[in-house]
């Protein structure tokens, strides 16, 4: 059965997945998909890495950990109820049927109603002053002068701040870690 993770609407969700590279930077391709892991690959891919870096991505999905050290945990920004469901983390170890597959269940709860609005730290998952917006056609990037300068280093820091430490503890218990080599 799937390990269950929870987040509230509007928060960032964290889905843990780890492996131990045989050598630093000696990466194994990984894919994340929406839906349970199929026999091969990932269905409905939301993010994919190759032996070097992230080569396929969709809006709101990031690897904020050090994926070159095997932390391929998925962060989903600003979740909605529609993000609920099973996610597949597939570590694509070379060789026939060697892949490691992890199914993780994400449960999104409605946001708690709070009497006073709290200040939210916004950042963009692209370059400074960039905001990606999606319509029916291809996404377009709008440049907004009012956005703060946030870069990849800061994004990683912010993601760590936003991460629910309870989920990290759940991960340690779930055993979603494998060693390669």
């Amino acid at each position: 059965s799937e390990v269950e993770y929870r987040a509230e609407v509007g928060q960032n969700a964290y889905l843990p997945c780890f492996y131990t590279p045989a050598a630093p930077g000696n990466l194994v391709p990984v894919c994340w998909g929406k839906g349970a892991c199929p026999v091969f690959e990932c269905g409905n891919v939301v993010l994919r890495t190759d032996e070097r870096d992230v080569n396929y991505w969709t809006s709101r999905y990031w690897l904020n950990g050090d994926f070159r050290k095997g932390d391929v945990s998925l962060t989903i920004e600003n979740v909605t109820l529609a993000d609920s469901g099973i996610y597949c983390c597939r570590i694509q170890i070379p060789g026939i049927m060697n892949d490691e597959k992890f199914n993780l269940k994400l449960v999104i709860k409605p946001a708690k109603v709070t009497p006073a609005p709290t200040r939210q730290r916004d950042f963009t998952a692209a370059f400074p002053r960039m905001l990606t917006t999606r319509g029916h056609g291809p996404a377009e990037t709008q440049t907004l002068g009012s956005l703060p300068d946030i870069n990849l280093t800061q994004i990683s820091t912010l993601a760590n701040e936003l991460r629910d430490s309870r989920l990290a503890n759940d991960l340690r218990d779930s055993g979603a870690t494998i060693r390669i080599g």
Partner: antibody, heavy 118, light 106 residues
């Protein structure tokens, strides 16, 4: 093996729009990666101009944002650069390159020289 | 924008020499730095990404190091085919390049 090939006019008049195309072979643009335009000035300085991703989203160099447009023709597996209101300062070798989400550039075209002159 | 200051702008060296090129970022860029080699009339070629990882096919004599604001490309034993111009690039924010270091034959 992925290959990228730039094409377009080598001479553009000032105030006109520079248009270049990059034809990609050996890989489908929609399958992944970011597809970039980078130029190199006569003094050898390199400038990233922008990219279009596999999904069609774009990011541009803020210094060029008002003049640059990058688009894709998936049926031809090509992506294109348009740079408006060019001046002599836009004279450069223009490269297309395949990059990652964190945009560093693993594959480059051979480059095409564009001169802006009347 | 983030400036990448490369030094030296040129150097003369002999085959077998150890060559070190440095790049200083105007602000913290983490490990988001790549290095490229360019020969006259050719496109740049990827050597190093994420500050220290060699691109496939790049000889082991090339190595990269550094994080934050200070980065180094080292060629442990210069070979005849290594005479070229080298560029650093940061990609922590929108990409910017160093001015280049031309490695010439002494």
């Amino acid at each position: 093996q992925v290959q990228l090939q730039e094409s377009g006019p080598g001479l553009v008049k000032p105030s006109q729009t520079l248009s270049l195309t990059c034809t990609v072979s050996g890989y489908s643009i929609t399958s992944g990666f970011a597809w970039n335009w980078i130029r190199q000035f006569p003094g050898n300085g390199l400038e990233w101009m922008g990219y279009i991703s596999h999904s069609g989203s774009t990011s541009y160099n803020p210094s060029l944002k008002s003049r640059v447009t990058i688009s894709v023709d998936t049926s031809k597996n090509q992506f294109s650069l348009k740079l408006s209101s060019v001046t002599a300062a836009d004279t450069a070798v223009y490269y297309c390159a395949r990059g990652y989400r964190s945009p560093w550039f693993a594959y480059w075209g051979q480059g095409t020289t564009v001169t802006v002159s009347s | 924008d983030i400036q990448m200051t490369q030094s030296p702008s040129s150097l003369s060296a002999s085959v077998g020499d150890r060559v070190t090129i440095t790049c200083k970022a105007s602000q913290n860029v983490g490990a988001n730095v790549a290095w490229y080699q360019q020969k006259p009339g050719k496109a740049p070629k990827s050597l190093i990404y994420s500050a220290s990882y060699r691109y496939s096919g790049v000889p082991s004599r090339f190595s990269g190091s550094g994080s934050g604001t200070d980065f180094t490309l080292t060629i442990s034993s210069l070979q005849p085919e290594d005479f070229a111009t080298y560029y650093c690039q940061q990609y922590n924010s929108y990409p910017t390049f160093g001015g280049g270091t031309k490695v010439e034959i002494k």
